[in-house]
Amino acid sequence: IIDGAPCARGSHPWQVALLSGNQLHCGGVLVNERWVLTAAHCKMNEYTVHLGSDTLGDRRAQRIKASKSFRHPGYSTQTHVNDLMLVKLNSQARLSSMVKKVRLPSRCEPPGTTCTVSGWGTTTSPDVTFPSDLMCVDVKLISPQDCTKVYKDLLENSMLCAGIPDSKKNACNGDSGGPLVCRGTLQGLVSWGTFPCGQPNDPGVYTQVCKFTKWINDTMKKHR
């Protein structure tokens, strides 16, 4: 997260980290006791999922292995359209004050809405500084028309843009798959942006979760 600050302790109990061994790979969100939602470009063969603490490496955190993941069938490694994936935990997460399910959206929020993006990704770019504490930054949803002015044909229908004019505030590497939460509901998953991260007027691009609630629910049912 670029130009952010540590999240208020326990304010993101649905935030998870996907680890490869002990190394941060991506962010994600807990949908229910068995399922984590993240970005399709975060696909690995096996995951260790960190839940229940804002601090990576916290011994009090839950760590659960996951071996099965289901990319959206329409994901493209070229255009990055449909960049979302469900990861099935090998054992159930224990819900608590620090481990809660995210609220999936019942509607798509409009441009101008203030949202929070969070993650343990690098806080500097191109030189990297990985924080141990979960970082947050507030950004505003940007209309597809305005975002297309920046990204032209790279922007697809189910992509959502967010940023602050003339500001560095943005996601970065390691934040992928993590949540963009607006008015208490999950509206986006960190997908991509320009490099170095945090270039003013280059919005962050997110998978627009409100377009995929049916696929999310259907996939969890199908692979119960």
Epitope: Q78, V128, L154, S191, G193
Partner: antibody, heavy 127, light 108 residues
């Protein structure tokens, strides 16, 4: 300003191992989120990618050379290295090291262009 | 592997000419294409990244376009220092990273 400099023997015997080092100055190989790349160019021919290594020391190799190639990083010396085993005359080329600049973050991070290059070093394979 | 085919392999042009070089990928690579210039005895130099973005410090007479499988590098008004060989390169998410065969721009 970042600079890259290749070094290593200019002559290698057939069946031996070619070893080259790229020294990075003006930037830190251990803290910058770039790819570090080896490319070669046989005399009078085009460019061929050998392989790359990233910030996490993950390596990516050209399948046609994979069984013979090792790329590694020495962060204490701000260097990355190439080893190519069992060389033949076909491995005679100018060898370049370069920095791969990602085209984006997240889903666009694994795509890159080489924005800084060493001047190249000529390696001849001959007995 | 994705094959990158450049055309023409060589061309002769005069100072001030508009020059166009094309690069075709054997399958779609979205906008993940870069262009390089190489002068004899020198290392390649990045001109264009992501199909159409001009690398910092590169003169604006160079431009790139295209998406999917067909790409173009255009030099709007050829200068004496532009006589060189030009290569396209497909970004390496689709390994291996591959270059086109090159286009040599010579003085007419």
């Amino acid at each position: 300003q970042l600079q890259l400099q290749e070094s290593g023997p200019g002559l290698v015997k057939p069946s031996e191992t070619l070893s080259l080092t790229c020294t990075v100055s003006g930037g830190s190989i251990s803290s910058d989120d770039y790819y570090w790349v080896w490319i070669r160019q046989p005399p009078g021919k085009g460019l061929e990618w050998i392989g790359s290594i990233d910030y996490f020391a993950s390596t990516y190799y050209n399948p046609s050379l994979k069984s013979r190639v090792t790329i590694s990083v020495d962060t204490s010396k701000n260097q990355f290295s190439l080893k190519l085993s069992s060389v033949t005359a076909a491995d005679t080329a100018v060898y370049y090291c370069a920095r791969g600049r990602p085209l984006g973050y997240g889903a666009r991070h694994d795509y890159y262009g080489m924005d800084v290059w060493g001047q190249g070093t000529t390696v001849t394979v001959s007995s | 592997d994705i094959q990158m085919t450049q055309s023409p392999s060589s061309l002769s042009a005069s100072v001030g000419d508009r020059v166009t070089i094309t690069c075709r990928a054997s399958q779609s690579i979205s906008s993940y294409l870069n262009w390089y210039q190489q002068k004899p005895g020198k290392a390649p130099k990045l001109l264009i990244y992501s199909a159409s973005s001009l690398q910092s410090g590169v003169p604006s007479r160079f431009s790139g376009s295209g998406s999917g499988t067909d790409f173009t590098l255009t030099i709007s008004s050829l200068q004496p220092e532009d006589f060189a060989t030009y290569y396209c390169q497909q970004s390496p998410y689709f390994p291996p990273l591959t270059f086109g065969g090159g286009t040599k721009v010579e003085i007419k």
